[in-house]
């Protein structure tokens, strides 16, 4: 069987000031079992957006049904952007266990954010 | 209900060190970034510091850099800043505050802890 | 370094009237504007954020509006219990993150 690839098709999102960003993330296969974590950054600085898992994440809806069993779209929408918010986002798969461990990243998305219109 | 308690403040001299702990509950503790803010007699908040939620990210005011640092066990449900070098300007109720997310507001502070420094 | 300015320093309102508190910012926050409550001798509490949501508890008699630099916090009928220091907080750029320099609510 292939191993899972964590895809972000888009390598850069430009998003105005107060509005929102779309963030796209898709597993090739359900296997491993275990939940997807969103950070902006990389390494040890890196910041949790959003953990599929546990925790209230309240800028951020994910785009279809993360929590159905078969989902392997784990797409964000993070609200009310502000230029703190710029930075490369990656979508990060975890493998399932005590605790869970990092199984694969995507390539990530580059969010720049525009000043608002005005 | 979350929950922030403060201990290990005191009286301590001029470069002398101190490490104050929060310890927290009613909340996903290693999910959220949490910060150290001050207030002096007196007078108004200042923060102070920030460490991200898996504890490798850190920032810190100018007033403390290169002398506080801040730290967490996540395993524990614990954060902590060492104060080393202490200065009477340090003198201050220390609060620990969680944020509501990664790029937010503090949403919960804690009770405070009084650090004074004085020769 | 964005700079909170809040405004007045002391504001001394009778039971039952309207308090207007200020804070303004020196360039834009968007939204990104919090206010907390510290009473005496306790902690600070979170009031009101993103400019205009009030936080779980917080009595409807507090509103939050405003945004870009000029922000309000306002009281519509002041309770003795509102005697407090009010603080705008903003978290649109960071770090640091600053606060405003309060501003006392006395009842008169």
């Known amino acids: 069987e292939e191993e899972l690839q964590v895809i972000q098709p888009d390598k850069s999102v430009s998003v105005a000031a107060g509005e929102s960003a779309i963030l796209h993330c898709t597993v090739t296969s359900l296997i491993p079992v275990g939940p997807i974590q969103w950070f902006r950054g990389a390494g040890p600085a890196r910041e949790l957006i959003y953990n599929q898992k546990e925790g209230h994440f309240p800028r951020v809806t994910t785009v279809s049904e993360s929590t159905k069993r078969e989902n392997m779209d784990f797409s964000i929408s993070i609200s009310n952007i502000t230029p703190a918010d710029a930075g490369t986002y990656y979508c990060v798969k975890f493998r399932k266990g005590s605790p869970d461990t990092e199984f694969k990243s995507g390539a990530g998305t580059e969010l720049s954010v525009r000043a608002k219109p005005s | 209900d979350v929950q922030l308690v403060e201990s290990g403040g005191g009286v301590v001299r001029p470069g002398e060190s101190l490490r104050l702990s929060c310890a927290a509950s009613?909340?996903?503790?290693?999910?959220?970034?949490m910060n150290w803010v001050r207030q002096a007699p007196g007078e108004g908040l200042e923060w102070v510091s920030r460490i991200n939620s898996g504890g490798g990210g850190t920032d810190y005011a100018e007033s403390v850099k290169g002398r506080f640092t801040i730290s967490r066990d996540n395993s524990e449900n614990t954060l902590y800043l060492q104060m080393n070098s202490l200065r009477a300007e340090d003198t201050a109720v220390y609060y620990c505050?969680?944020?509501?997310?990664?790029?937010?507001?503090?949403?919960?502070w804690g009770l405070g802890a009084l650090v004074t420094v004085s020769s | 370094e964005t700079v909170l300015t809040q405004s007045p320093a002391t504001l001394s309102v009778s039971p039952g009237e309207r308090a207007t508190l200020s804070c303004r910012a020196s360039?834009?926050?968007?939204?990104?504007l919090a206010w907390h409550q510290q009473k005496p001798g306790q902690a600070p509490r979170l009031l009101i954020y993103?400019?205009?949501n009030r936080a779980t508890g917080i009595p409807d008699r507090f509103s939050g509006s405003g945004s870009g630099t000029d922000f309000t916090l306002t009281i519509s009928s002041l309770q003795t219990e509102d005697s407090a220091v009010y603080y705008c907080?903003?978290?649109?750029?960071?770090?640091?993150?600053?606060f405003g320099g309060g501003t006392k609510v006395e009842i008169k």
């Open positions: 907080q903003q978290y649109y750029y960071w770090p640091p993150y600053r």
């Open positions: 009613g909340f996903s503790f290693s999910s959220y970034a």
């Open positions: 993103d400019a205009t």
């Open positions: 505050a969680k944020q509501y997310d990664w790029n937010g507001f503090f949403d919960y």
């Open positions: 360039q834009t926050v968007g939204s990104k």
